[in-house]
Amino acid sequence: QKSSIEKCSVDIQQSRNKTTERPGLLNCPIYWQQLREKCLLFSHTVNPWNNSLADCSTKESSLLLIRDKDELIHTQNLIRDKAILFWIGLNFSLSEKNWKWINGSFLNSNDLEIRGDAKENSCISISQTSVYSEYCSTEIRWICQKELTPVRNKVYPDS
């Protein structure tokens, strides 16, 4: 049995996968910040997790996916205000009783030290210093991400 949050997450990911291929992104758009091979957009407004997920989707992006602790630290370094929380693309899957990224993968327990409960209707936020489990209905800021396309050096045949 999937929760409404899970259904929304799956629906948005599927609709994103169905959209036509777009040319690779070589530079971050205006107002997006580059972090390694990603462009990040930190919202100024606040929304529940579902609305944040939908907003990133309309921007042809996704809620932030964090690969490892190193990426978490680098992302947190971009957060200017101590007290502000941002949604990322991780929520609790009731059916699998585990934290699940919006791309379908499960959280490696070593990646993030989450403060708070792992239970139904819990979604993950990050601050400058910590990672928190919050009710998904809580209205906070959020981070969208776009992947940058790596530029490959062209190899020219001998002339």
């Epitope: 957009l41 930190f42 919202s43 407004t45 609305n51």
Partner: antibody, heavy 117, light 110 residues
Framework: QVQLQESGPGLVKPSETLSLTCTVS????????WSWIRQPAGKGLEWIGR???????NYNPSLKSRVTMSEDTSNNQFSLKLSSVTAADTAVYYC???????????WGQGTLVTVSS | QSALTQPPSASGSPGQSVTISCTGT?????????VSWYQQHPGKAPKLMIY???KRPSGVPDRFSGSKSGNTASLTVSGLQAEDEADYYC??????????FGGGTKLTVL
């Protein structure tokens, strides 16, 4: 180049509903948020509200009970409705791009709406 | 009555520097780094000059700079030029997705 153009009646009767549309060119309205701002003659600016194309709207608390905003992504337009207008709603109404939800980087040229019988 | 307080007028001679203040509360200016400034010439739409306290959009001369201390934000125009004569408005995010403006300051180049 991003351009915004407001359109709608320049004269509205008291107690009726003011309706304006903003047409955006040079950018997809799906990519940003969009706001309405007004300015009575010789006075300061007042933010009315914003719309996200994901369906969310945020309104100025002082106007919330009278404001409705909607969008038409197929025509790259968004709209404002302000109900139960009075002479105090007479102003130049601007639509603007609201990239992150706290500032406005592209504005329409504005349209004057007069509330009078 | 505007939510943010600006002086009604400011002036300076060409080449001089002028600073316009914008005072709010801890719920708006003091609470967020989301202050912006707009220039408006008579009969024209406002133009964004500064956002996120001190960032300048492309095309805005570096003579315009922004700063913030506590509940007060400031716009400084250095090397004043005749075309800088206009009304200037500050704005701030004010929590729960609200935005507030100042009452405006008329800048006169003497």
């Amino acid at each position: 180049q991003v351009q915004l153009q407001e359109s709608g009646p320049g004269l509205v009767k008291p107690s009726e509903t003011l309706s304006l549309t903003c047409t955006v060119s040079g950018d997809s309205i799906r990519t940003y948020y969009w706001s309405w701002i007004r300015q009575p003659a010789g006075k300061g600016l007042e933010w009315i509200g914003r719309i996200y194309t994901s369906g969310t709207t945020n309104y100025n608390p002082s106007l919330k009970s009278r404001v409705t905003m909607s969008e038409d992504t197929s025509n790259n337009q968004f709209s404002l409705k302000l109900s139960s207008v009075t002479a105090a709603d007479t102003a130049v109404y601007y639509c603007a791009r609201d990239p992150l939800g706290s500032f406005f980087d592209y504005w329409g040229q504005g349209t004057l709406v007069t509330v009078s019988s | 009555q505007s939510a943010l307080t600006q002086p009604p007028s400011a002036s300076g001679s060409p080449g001089q520097s002028v600073t316009i203040s914008c005072t709010g509360t801890s719920s708006d200016v003091g609470g967020y780094n989301y202050v912006s400034w707009y220039q408006q010439h008579p009969g024209k739409a406002p133009k964004l000059m500064i956002y996120e306290v001190s960032k300048r959009p492309s095309g805005v001369p570096d003579r315009f700079s922004g700063s913030k201390s506590g509940n007060t934000a400031s716009l400084t125009v250095s090397g004043l030029q005749a075309e800088d004569e206009a009304d200037y408005y500050c704005s701030s995010y004010a929590g729960i997705n609200n935005v507030v403006f100042g009452g405006g300051t008329k800048l006169t180049v003497l």
